[in-house]
């Protein structure tokens, strides 16, 4: 009598992750009696795939009907394919007893399941940096198969180069995981600014994934101060102006003191955007000469983002305002502006 | 699934033409497309693919002598300036449900023959 | 660009016979590499993706080995319609691009 085959023709299989898999196996003959396994992996760690006799396996159904009389067909599909699923799958007859002998396995078929890379997220730093100063985004996508993978940065459409990226894990592994770091260099003009991580993967059809970050979440672009005196008012009161200009973000609080005391405090609030995504914000006080007999010291102070007070200060003359209409005396700027880069 | 080339003829040197890949049974907005042509007696040759967003990447060689674009049901390739050695049969072909690594559904190919 | 070396440029067989062609990449494509049967006035036939698997439809007696820069597609015994000319195909996945072998003409000894 000829010797009991079993075939399983396909040396390999290549799925995409979420589609079925058909692993197919025929016997080349009835005899002898006993049923038919489906494993995956050899040897004593070998997980059980699929028995028609016992056990539930939501996952996989037989391809023809295995109870039907001289069936020879012990095909599978294995549906909702995921990259845990790869590995070699064997058919193995065992000839009926108690308990059932193994008889005779196939040759196996190697699973093979690509899977797209999740779309990237983009995280950028923690706290906001200043022009001129180095941030770094970070870009990571999971859930990819094969491995290969390429990752790319790019800056208003300008690809960047201070990258550093990493595929885990190293070794074989049935999904992998892909992390990467952008530096980027701020300066002023970056509020409107974007970066993106571009993903491309065999899987992906054509174009890459990306995931963007707005510089705007990482920058902080501090104020100028300019404190100016208008002309002197009929009612000898001066007006004096604090403009604050090209900042971002809009949180901002403004305090005039007159000779170190408090006089007012505001807070920026729906300020309209610069071309650049900046804002400006001027802020007038209104000083009676008449009221002071010594010359007036006032100081514009702007806290900025949380960040440590900005002081402007202005000396208004009150001698060289005669308690009479028509002086257009310009007041003399003793201050300076003390603004720093932080 | 099928694909069919159309707009292959005689054309002088210089003359723009453009054929086009009439596709049914799938989406054109799912799959990466790709052109390809053989000069008689001669090997296969990659021009161009177009993306399933409808970016289109070239060769090397190309250089701007082709445009691929696409519409619903369509995918063209554009002859900007033919000269006689763009005589070939031009195929156009889909990528694989597993990915644009390999090429699984061809059509039969148009012949273009650029003589003056 | 990948430069894809096919060999030999043409052989001859019988019916029966076990034929293999080679395909060579000038740098490595990992398992990136398709293999088509063209028969004369006819559109390629995918026979082999990812190196080693076997599209649908296709007998099994075609089969494909090799990664990184040496790949071989195998008939383990060569039928009468299957003289034809083969060609190897990469993708490389940092440059996208698509790079075919020269062919492999099989006529009939």
């Known amino acids: 009598e000829e010797e009991l085959q079993v075939i399983q023709p396909e040396k390999s299989v290549s799925v995409a992750a979420g589609d079925s898999a058909t692993l197919n196996c025929t016997v080349s003959s009835l005899i002898p009696v006993g049923p038919i396994q489906w494993f995956r992996g050899a040897g004593p760690g070998r997980e059980l795939i699929y028995n028609l006799k016992e056990g539930h396996f939501p996952r996989v159904t037989p391809v023809s009907d295995p109870t039907k009389r001289n069936n020879m067909d012990f095909s599978i599909r294995i549906s909702n394919i995921t990259p845990a699923d790869a590995g070699t799958y064997y058919c193995v007859k065992f000839r009926k007893g108690s308990p059932d002998v193994e008889l005779k396995s196939g040759a196996g078929t190697e699973l093979s399941v690509r899977a797209k890379p999740s779309a990237p997220v983009v995280s950028g730093p923690a706290v906001r940096a200043t022009a001129e100063h180095t941030v770094s985004f970070t870009c990571e996508s999971h859930g990819f198969s094969p491995r290969d993978i390429t990752l790319k940065w790019f800056k208003n459409g300008n690809e960047l180069s201070d990258v550093q990226t990493n595929v885990d894990p190293a070794g074989k592994s049935v999904s992998y995981s892909i992390r990467s770091t952008a530096r980027v260099v701020l300066t002023r003009r970056d509020v409107h600014s974007q970066v993106i991580c571009e993903v491309a993967h065999v899987t992906l059809q054509g174009d890459p994934l990306r995931g963007t970050a707005n510089l705007s979440e990482a920058i902080r672009v501090p104020p100028f101060l300019e404190v100016t005196q208008q002309s002197m008012r009929a009612d000898n009161q001066v007006n004096v102006t604090c403009q604050v200009t090209k900042f971002y973000p809009q949180r901002l609080q403004l305090t005039w003191l007159e000779n170190g005391n408090v006089s007012r405090t505001e807070m920026a609030s729906a300020l309209p955007e610069n071309k650049d995504g900046t804002y400006n914000w001027t802020s007038w006080l209104l000083v009676n000469v008449s009221a002071h007999r010594d010359d007036v010291k006032l100081t514009c102070q702007v806290e900025h983002d949380g960040q440590p007070a900005v002081n402007k200060s202005f000396s208004v003359k009150v001698s060289a305002h005669p308690k009479e209409q028509g002086s257009n005396t310009a007041a003399e700027n003793t201050g300076t502006n003390e603004r720093n880069i932080y | 699934v099928q694909l069919v080339e159309s707009g292959g003829r005689l054309v002088q040197p210089g003359t723009p033409l453009t054929l086009s890949c009439t596709v049914s049974g799938f989406s054109l907005s799912s799959y990466v497309m790709g052109w390809f042509r053989q000069a008689p007696g001669k090997g296969l040759e990659y021009i161009g693919i177009i993306s399933s967003s409808g970016s289109p990447y070239y060769a090397s060689w190309v250089n701007g002598r082709f445009t691929i674009s696409k519409t619903s049901t369509t995918m063209d390739l554009k002859m900007n300036s033919p000269t006689t050695e763009d005589t070939a049969t031009y195929f156009c072909?889909?990528?694989?449900?597993?990915?644009?690594?390999?090429?699984?559904?061809w059509g039969p190919g148009t012949l273009v023959t650029v003589s003056s | 660009d990948i430069q894809m070396t096919q060999s030999p440029s043409s052989l001859s067989a019988s019916v029966g016979d076990r034929v293999t062609i080679t395909c060579r990449a000038s740098?490595?494509?990992?398992?990136?590499l398709a293999w088509y049967q063209q028969k004369p006035g006819k559109a390629p036939k995918l026979l082999i993706y990812s190196a080693s698997f076997l599209y649908s439809g296709v007998p099994s007696r075609f089969s494909g080995s090799g990664s990184g820069t040496d790949f071989t597609l195998t008939i383990s015994s060569l039928q009468p319609e299957d003289f034809a000319t083969y060609y190897c195909?990469?993708?490389?996945?940092?440059?996208?691009?698509?790079?075919f072998g020269q062919g492999t003409k099989v006529e009939i000894k």
């Open positions: 072909a889909r990528v694989g449900p597993l990915g644009v690594d390999y090429f699984n559904i």
């Open positions: 195909q990469s993708w490389h996945y940092i440059s996208r691009s698509y790079t």
């Open positions: 740098q490595s494509i990992n398992s990136y």
